[in-house]
């Protein structure tokens, strides 16, 4: 009796299953009690000897390429051996590499977690993923794994992490890069500082008082609110960052506490109050302000 090994599919792609069947064309396996064993090169596969003429391999990999055969043994210990069959496992080169971010859109707040997710649409086997910072490409990390995606994490983002990033994937057919992704690090405003600026050391009624509010840190645009005794005077903005000013034509009622508030949508911060007092110098007829 002759024995044949049939592999289905005969040219598997990496990661796909294969069924090995040990066939005896001129003999029904039910006619006698047979035990079957499958081999690759010199090594027995799966459970070793078994009553089933089939062996299911869940996933084939490039390193599983080799020479396969099977053996059948009767109860009388007669051993039949099939001819060797060459099984070549086909590797799919990586293609369509993309880089995505979590949070999406590449905008992340300072101190928050950023994940750069490198994905391939196609590709089998061990894929090496590499992450790079900047268009020139400072290598951040590499990971080799059997999956179509891999992650690089920055647990707490800093201002210096605002850059362009890209990733590269490769599985033996040469590197395949993703496109560039820009990361914007949004920085909440710091506590602003309020300064009062007058045209002279002792400002008088009808002088123009400039209230200048500035948060030294914070992503633009920044909106500033100006207050006198907790009453809103109005708002001004700093489209490119920095400070903003609000002008007041002084009257006697403008004596008192002034403050400002900064917000860029990531959190408001209020300045310390600055006090403006009217003083009437001896022999002077007009009121003066001091701060």
């Amino acid at each position: 009796a002759e024995l044949f090994l049939i592999a289905s599919p005969s040219h598997p792609t990496e990661g796909s299953p294969v069924t090995l069947t040990c066939k005896m064309p001129f003999l029904q396996s039910s006619d006698a009690q047979f035990q079957f064993c499958f081999f690759r090169d010199t090594r027995a596969l799966g459970p070793g000897w078994s009553s089933s003429p089939k062996l299911q391999i869940a996933a084939m990999w490039k390193e599983d390429t080799g020479s396969y055969w099977c053996e059948a043994q009767t109860m009388a210990s007669k051993v039949l051996r099939s001819r060797r069959s060459q099984i070549n496992v086909h590797r799919v080169p990586v293609a369509d590499v993309s880089l995505e971010t979590q949070p999406p859109g590449g905008q992340v707040m300072e101190g928050d977690r950023l994940v750069l997710i490198c994905s391939v649409a196609m590709g089998t086997g061990d894929i090496t993923f590499l992450w790079y910072k900047g268009a020139v490409g400072l290598n951040l990390q590499s990971k080799t794994q059997r999956s179509l995606t891999a992650e690089y994490e920055i647990p707490s983002v800093r201002e210096s992490d605002a850059e362009q990033y890209y990733c590269v994937a490769e599985n033996g057919y040469g590197p395949s890069p993703s496109g560039l992704v820009s990361i914007t690090v949004r920085i909440p405003v710091s506590r602003p500082i309020l300064m009062l600026r007058a045209p002279r050391a002792q400002a008088a009624v009808e002088d123009v008082l400039e209230l200048h509010c500035e948060a030294l840190r914070g992503s633009p645009p920044i909106l500033y609110w100006f207050y006198h005794e907790d009453i809103t005077l109005g708002s001004r903005s700093a489209p490119s960052g920095g400070g903003a000013s609000f002008n007041l034509s002084l009257t006697e009622e403008h004596s008192g506490n002034y403050s400002c508030e900064a917000n860029n949508g990531l959190g408001a911060q209020r300045s310390e109050a600055v006090t403006l007092n009217f003083t009437v110098p001896t022999g002077a007829r007009s009121n003066h302000l001091t701060s």
Partner: antibody, heavy 116, light 108 residues
């Protein structure tokens, strides 16, 4: 005294457009941000759109982004809301509110009904 | 987006009783939370701003407290005109400027 008065509401068919106006008086309009807030019948308040004192920055709720446009004319002390591609779910009373930076003054509202 | 959750949805009380309304933020809004009162057919009215400051013309029976994520509006002794819907709103992080879903204070 501070006053904001909305106008321009009415009944409109789905897919059509409407422009709301908000006339402000009693304060220096060009010093304050302005917002539109809506309230569907029997529901809570929903912020719709906001604009900075000088019109330089505009913000929209996701539900209206790409369909509504907020604008202002500081020379006329007027705030606008251009509403395009209206849907049944846009049916609401639309309020305009002054930002100080709290919403300290509100208009009486104008009813927009989107119905075929 | 910061989500504001108000509780309870409805508060049934009698005039003269104390009302305690809660507003919880999904993340810190510092002290930048306001409370509004709305009566049927009327526009909302600013009651409390920056968590604890009474707006102009608001009676002393209204008080606000809290910071971070947990805020409370207290009406020490309910007057007949206080029966209304109350909303909290944050202005710390935007867009969007968000409101709570409201608490209705009704006569028991």
């Amino acid at each position: 005294q501070v006053q904001v008065v909305e106008s321009g509401g009415g009944v409109v068919q789905p897919g059509r457009s409407l422009r709301l106006s908000c006339a402000a008086s009693g304060f220096t309009f060009s010093n304050y941000g302005m917002h539109w807030v809506r309230q569907a019948p029997g529901k809570g308040l929903e912020w719709v759109a906001g604009i900075w004192y000088d019109g330089s920055n505009k913000y929209y709720a996701d539900s209206v982004k790409g369909r509504f446009t907020i604008s202002r004319d500081n020379s006329k002390n007027t705030l606008y809301l251009q509403m395009n591609s209206l849907r049944a779910e846009d049916t609401a009373v639309y309020y305009c509110a002054r930002e100080s930076p709290n919403f300290d003054y509100w208009g009486q509202g104008t009813l927009v009904t989107v119905s075929s | 987006e910061i989500v504001l959750t108000q509780s309870p949805a409805t508060l049934s009380l009698s005039p003269g009783e104390r009302a305690t309304l809660s507003c919880r933020a999904s993340q810190s809004v510092s002290s930048y939370l306001a409370w509004y009162q709305q009566k049927p057919g009327q526009a909302p009215r600013l009651l409390i701003y920056d968590a604890s400051n009474r707006a102009t013309g608001i009676p002393a029976r209204f008080s606000g407290s809290g910071s971070g994520t947990d805020f409370t509006l207290t009406i020490s002794s309910l007057e007949p005109e206080d029966f209304a819907v109350y909303y909290c709103q944050q202005r710390n992080n935007w867009p969007p400027w968000t409101f709570g879903q409201g608490t209705k204070v009704e006569i028991k």
